[in-house]
Interface confidence: low
Amino acid sequence: MRGSHHHHHHGSSHMAPTHQLPPSDVRKIILELQPLSRGLLEDYQKKETGVPESNRTLLLCLTSDSQPPRLNSSAILPYFRAIRPLSDKNIIDKIIEQLDKLKFQHEPETEISVPADTFECKSFILTILQQFSACLESVFKSLNSGPQ
């Protein structure tokens, strides 16, 4: 899909909050993200019937060091930046905008390369969208069960 490329790794930093957002703000962001994510996933599933989920792609979308789990924006953002060209321009940009609000400035962001093979690429995108939707559900539930 991508053609051959030269690759060298380094993180890229973007403007982001230096402190943790209050739960009410996080809840607002999650509420914004849910319909965007669901719409994107449903749209993709309609277009790409018969594409299986990839067992090689794992979106580490929740932090393991906080209780309740927090959305790991720094881990998610690179995947959405990578699939931007292959999905709905406006929806992906809105998702990135919301994820940027959740990201901490000191957290490094690694670039992700989309699989070169067309079928693998479709599977990769589907998996990211499915796992992200599931993560949002999980975070939303934990936010609702805790203090508002």
């Epitope: 991508r2 292959l86 670039e111």
Partner: antibody
Framework: EVQLVESGGDLVKPGGSLKLSCAAS????????MSWVRQTPDKRLEWVAT????????YYPDNIKGRFTISRDNAKNTLYLQMSSLKSEDTAMYYC???????????WGQGTSVTVSS | DILLTQSPASLAVSLGQRAIISCKAS??????????MHWYQQKPGQQPKLLIY???NLEAGVPTRFSGSGSRTDFTLNIHPVEEEDAATYFC?????????FGGGTKLEIK
């Protein structure tokens, strides 16, 4: 307002080198992939190189690979194209272009002219 | 490499009429149900400007008289009704595969 201003174009001899720069403003430079596209004297457009938003991934067509190097300095909001082993067929107007992700080129600079001739 | 063939090379259209420009790809440029084909307008002495991205999406600020359609190998740019300011050269470009390639251009003249 998105602005891309190219500089560094010149008349150069075959086999020579040249470095083009593109100063970007009006948008968050480090969030966008960037490309160089050239327009030959007969007005044909040719893609030259692309670099991902953080600089980790670079892409070139086969006729360019090994001769040109695209790079970026996100702290300075600047894109570069280092050109070496220049040939007469590299004569063109070189445009700096903002990318949407990897695939759509939504803003183009005014261009800088490169002439390769003895 | 994917070859893009634009037709016609030039056309003259009366003010208010419809201009249709075709772009044919040597192989499919669709991915995930989307045509990775884009259209640019270039006026004399100016840089190209994005009009339509991914086959049919109108770029922000572009008048609605411009529209794009097509999938796989056949794509079309429609301009209706044509206005004086539309006199320009139009290019298609694919990003389905590297190297990205452009069509040879179609010069539109307004009668």
């Amino acid at each position: 307002e998105v602005q891309l201003v190219e500089s560094g174009g010149d008349l150069v001899k075959p086999g020579g080198s040249l470095k083009l720069s593109c100063a970007a403003s009006g948008f968050s430079f480090s969030n966008y992939g960037m490309s160089w596209v050239r327009q030959t004297p007969d007005k044909r457009l040719e893609w030259v190189a692309t670099i991902s938003y953080g600089g980790s991934y670079t892409y070139y067509p086969d006729n360019i690979k090994g001769r040109f190097t695209i790079s970026r300095d996100n702290a300075k909001n600047t894109l570069y194209l280092q050109m070496s082993s220049l040939k007469s067929e590299d004569t063109a107007m070189y445009y700096c272009v903002r990318g949407y992700g990897y695939d759509t080129m939504d803003y183009w600079g005014q261009g800088t002219s490169v002439t390769v001739s003895s | 490499d994917i070859l893009l063939t634009q037709s016609p090379a030039s056309l003259a259209v009366s003010l208010g009429q419809r201009a249709i420009i075709s772009c044919k790809a040597s192989q499919s440029v669709s991915f995930a149900g989307t045509g990775l084909m884009h259209w640019y307008q270039q006026k004399p002495g100016q840089q190209p400007k994005l009009l339509i991205y991914r086959a049919s999406n109108l770029e922000a600020g572009v008048p609605t008289r411009f529209s794009g359609s097509g999938s796989r190998t056949d794509f079309t740019l429609n301009i209706h009704p044509v206005e004086e300011e539309d006199a320009a050269t139009y290019f298609c470009q694919q990003s389905r595969e590297y190297p990205w390639t452009f069509g040879g251009g179609t010069k539109l003249e307004i009668k």
